[in-house]
């Protein structure tokens, strides 16, 4: 046979969907890979062949499109499972093939289980709504082109394992979910539970959100250096251990990249002869401010390291800022005493 | 200093509207949640109506929703409550209150007392 | 909703001696409780937030604990312009809601 371009197996779509529920599957060749789409592809004399390898084997087989009620069935570039069942695990196949030319790419599908409180092995996109916003809006996500539009589905929201019915700030309208200026404790994992009938059978589609309420763009604010600070001395004498901690708050700032670095005369550490270490962690609030602290220590501190400058700097999208550690050797003068 | 005044209250007969206001001073009135809560004669503080600060998210107690509408006027640095239908159980002090997630009520006007009555 | 009842309605104390007052919630509010100090013809001031955390200007002798069902605010020793009634207020979830006050009086 003649050559096929294998684009290998697309670990970047991980596809999940739910035991017992519809499912319809786009073949990626023309979403990711090729530069046409299926109806060009079809019209050139183009075939669309799909096959796949169960869970835990390496034989691929044909999928079989002659189960009862046609469980399995394919449209254009589309399969579709009216249900899908455990077993249904798998890599799957789409090939496009002539006798001249032939692309091919696999997939993973993996049929997961859930209980009656929505739990799974799922993974739920993420909604990241500003607190105190007015109005937030999710929509009952991956439901499209299940039903036509002319099929009005009922659908069901939930907060974790409870309906939402009279929840105070939170409006189920049809496919969409309302919050009215959301606090903390809207967070959460949202479910809609769609439920349409097609030839004489109910269907039914679950999807979940993770709503995380973070702070507002009107709270967003430069980096904020809590130490080092003018109050503080470093005063040491030399063999001792010198530790300066650089903590900074960075305000909730949507695909911000927020950064803190230490400069010792005006270099970075990697760039001095000084024999530094440098820590990081970095904490979290409840509406995802961050607190980010660097510790720079310095085993046995010499008289020349009791010199030099040493100032924390910090970066968001918002702006920098930096402050110099107050550092001195033990002896030299009057100051107030070193508190950490 | 933060200064919240209140003004509109008065007399008015059951089935009736009343039309609240709140002044704010000293702040930046449009980056703040604000609030109505209300106090009757002898009685304890019930949360009315809150406004997100741009003013398109609003909310009521449910002893109030479909009759008292909250709005705001940032430009103006003013507050409102548009009551309607009113009954002898309104009848109370009305206070405007700066509204934070994570502090609650943390500055309120004088109050303003509306008294519903034939 | 949630429902926050205070413990006990009045209060009888002797100034200079100390004043314990309770809140309860009916579900969680986490840390999100404030208490506030109200005089008669006055309008609320607020004294604690965060369930501990005075606000600006609040002496020392107010402090409050507790978290998620269970609170307290504490008068270490009062004074006689600390003779008022004191309400709890959770604002965790909409509606934000108060407790029905607890009337501090002089013994």
């Known amino acids: 046979s003649e050559r096929c371009d294998d684009w290998g197996l697309d670990t970047m779509r991980q596809i999940q969907v739910f035991e017992d529920e519809p499912a319809r599957i786009k073949c990626p060749l023309f979403e990711h890979f090729l530069k046409y789409n299926y109806s060009t592809a079809h019209s050139s004399g183009l075939t669309l062949i799909w096959y796949w390898t169960r869970q835990d084997r390496d034989l691929e087989e044909p999928i079989n499109f002659r189960l009862p009620e046609n469980r399995i069935s394919k449209e254009k570039d589309v399969l579709w499972f009216r249900p899908t069942l455990l077993n249904d695990t798998g890599n799957y196949t789409c090939m496009l093939r002539n006798t001249t030319y032939c692309s091919k790419v696999a997939f993973p599908l993996e049929v997961v289980q859930k209980d009656s409180c929505f739990n799974s092995a799922m993974r739920f996109p993420v909604h990241k709504m500003y607190i105190e916003h007015g109005i937030h809006k999710i929509t009952c996500p991956n439901v499209d082109g299940y039903f036509p539009s002319s099929v009005k589905p009922s659908v069901t929201w939930y907060k974790g394992c409870t309906e939402i019915v009279d929840f105070h700030n939170v409006l189920p309208e049809g496919m969409n979910l309302s919050f009215f200026i959301p606090l903390v404790s809207n967070n959460g994992n949202y479910t809609c539970v769609v439920t349409y009938p097609e030839n004489g059978r109910l269907f039914h589609l679950t999807r979940t959100v993770t709503v995380k309420v973070v702070g507002s763009p009107k709270d967003a604010l430069p980096p904020q250096i809590y130490s080092p600070n003018d109050r503080v001395v470093y005063e040491k004498e030399p063999g001792e251990e010198l530790v300066i901690p650089c903590k900074v708050y960075f305000s909730f700032i949507m695909d911000s990249h927020n950064e803190v670095w230490w400069t010792i005369d005006g270099k970075k550490p990697d760039d001095v002869t000084v024999d530094i270490t440098i820590n990081e962690s970095v904490s979290y609030s409840s509406t995802e401010d961050e607190t980010r602290t660097q510790i720079l220590s310095i085993k046995k501190v010499t008289p020349e390291d009791l010199r030099r400058n040493y100032v924390c700097h910090a970066r968001n999208t918002k702006g920098e800022a930096e402050q110099a550690a107050k550092v001195k050797q033990k002896g030299n003068g009057c100051t107030e005493p070193m508190t950490l | 200093e933060v200064q919240l005044l209140e003004s509109g209250g008065g007399l008015v007969q059951p089935g009736g509207s009343l039309r609240l206001s709140c002044a704010a001073s000293?702040?930046?009135?449009?980056?703040?949640?604000m609030s109505w809560v209300r106090q009757a004669p002898g009685k304890g503080l019930e949360w009315v109506s809150a406004?997100?600060?741009?003013?398109?998210?609003?909310l009521y107690a449910d002893s109030v929703k479909g009759r008292f509408t909250i709005s705001r006027d940032n430009s103006k640095n003013t507050l409102y409550l548009q009551m309607n239908s009113l009954r002898a159980e309104d009848t109370a002090v009305y206070y405007c209150?700066?509204?934070?997630?994570?502090?609650?009520?943390?500055?309120w006007g004088q109050g303003t007392l509306v008294t519903v009555s034939s | 909703e949630i429902v926050m009842t205070q413990s006990p309605a009045t209060l009888s104390v002797s100034p200079g001696e100390r004043a314990t007052l309770s809140c309860r919630a009916s579900?969680?509010?986490?840390?999100?409780l404030a208490w506030y100090q109200q005089k008669p013809g006055q309008a609320p001031r607020l004294l604690i937030y965060?369930?501990?955390t005075r606000a600006t200007g609040i002496p020392a002798r107010f402090s409050g604990s507790g978290s998620g069902t269970e609170f307290t605010l504490t008068i270490s020793s009062l004074q006689s312009e600390d003779f008022a009634v004191y309400y709890c207020?959770?604002?965790?979830?909409?509606?934000?809601?108060f407790g029905q006050g607890t009337k501090v009086e002089i013994k």
């Open positions: 209150a700066r509204s934070l997630y994570w502090s609650g009520f943390d500055y």
């Open positions: 000293g702040f930046t009135f449009s980056a703040y949640t």
């Open positions: 406004i997100s600060y741009e003013g398109d998210g609003t």
């Open positions: 579900q969680s509010v986490s840390s999100n």
């Open positions: 965060g369930a501990s």
């Open positions: 207020q959770q604002y965790n979830n909409w509606p934000w809601t």
